[in-house]
Amino acid sequence: AILGRSETQECLFFNANWERDRTNQTGVEPCYGDKDKRRHCFATWKNISGSIEIVKQGCWLDDINCYDRTDCIEKKDSPEVYFCCCEGNMCNEKFSYFPEMEVTQPTSNPVTPKPP
């Protein structure tokens, strides 16, 4: 491990379409990948009229957009589907939306999936 870097070995797993995809709905996902690559966690969600609906959470492959990010934060302004990634075990348990373009006070929506 490189000093100061959070190695990601497992992430929170959630799949809203678990029945269609034939997966578990929730759990812990071990992260696999080429040994020369970094690994991350991600979360995707939708904001339906102010209500947060998690789409998926899990492991994410080597991506410079995620390097050295200990928190999972979406910065894109009003995306259709929100996405964030981070480094460190289970770092996708909580996620937030802080749009970079926003002039008004940004709001944070830390969310953990409710058990089925």
Epitope: G58, L61, I64, V81
Partner: antibody, heavy 115, light 111 residues
Framework: QVQLVQSGAEVKKPGSSVKVSCKAS????????INWVRQAPGQGLEWMGT????????SYAQKFQGRVTITADTSTSTAYMELSSLRSEDTAVYYC????????WGQGTLVTVSS | QSALTQPRSVSGSPGQSVTISCTGT?????????VNWYQQHPGKAPKPMIY???RRPSGVPDRFSGSKSGNTASLTISGLQAEDEADYYC???????????FGGGTKLTVL
């Protein structure tokens, strides 16, 4: 092992559209991006665009903006690249590649645009 | 995004070393360690040789190395072998907020 298998060669008329598929296996499809790259005969590589396979978010090269659409079907682990208003200069081999680092590539799909 | 600049061709004898350059701007090559190098043999898909400026994928011989100085990235191949004769392309990471761009390609001839 990671594999990206693309659809077969296509011959198209100018003005028409083509849709090339890229079926992924050997890894979790929703854990990365799929990029699309093309290579005209005897020419270099040209980046067309990318899709985040889990969120569906896309980015396109300015040159192809408005003419290319990249989609992903997570239920079949397949990405698609559709190019419209084809012209002869679009004759090329079209590749899909996994992730932002383009670490695995499809075998390529030759699209020939000819009247 | 304009294409990265590579020499059209380079050559070397077996056992020698060659270096291929890839020049961009402060906003692509110069801004971060996200330059990749690919090897392409005729009629084949490109093969990643170096990513993130200097990281080598498993299976790639350590004769291949990458570096960067300012806005120029370089691929060095030492102990040239006949099978190294191919086209080499530099390119950038593409995904999220990053847009991809490739160099024009360099034809390496092993004399």
């Amino acid at each position: 092992q990671v594999q990206l298998v693309q659809s077969g060669a296509e011959v198209k008329k100018p003005g028409s559209s083509v849709k090339v598929s890229c079926k992924a296996s050997g890894y979790t499809f929703t854990s990365s991006y799929i990029n699309w790259v093309r290579q005209a005969p005897g020419q270099g590589l040209e980046w067309m665009g990318t899709i985040n396979a889990v969120s569906g978010s896309t980015s396109y090269a300015q040159k192809f903006q408005g003419r290319v659409t990249i989609t992903a079907d997570t239920s079949t682990s397949t990405a698609y690249m559709e190019l419209s208003s084809l012209r002869s200069e679009d004759t090329a081999v079209y590749y899909c590649a996994r992730g932002g680092w383009f670490d695995y590539w499809g075998q390529g799909t030759l699209v020939t645009v000819s009247s | 995004q304009s294409a990265l600049t590579q020499p059209r061709s380079v050559s070397g004898s077996p056992g020698q070393s060659v270096t291929i350059s890839c020049t961009g701007t402060s906003s692509d090559v110069g801004s971060a360690n996200y330059v990749n190098w690919y090897q392409q043999h005729p009629g084949k898909a490109p093969k990643p040789m170096i990513y993130g400026v200097s990281r080598r994928p498993s299976g790639v011989p350590d004769r291949f190395s990458g570096s960067k100085s300012g806005n120029t990235a370089s691929l060095t191949i030492s102990g040239l072998q006949a099978e190294d004769e191919a086209d080499y392309y530099c390119g950038t990471f593409a995904g999220g907020k990053y847009y991809g761009v490739f160099g024009g390609g360099t034809k390496l001839t092993v004399l």
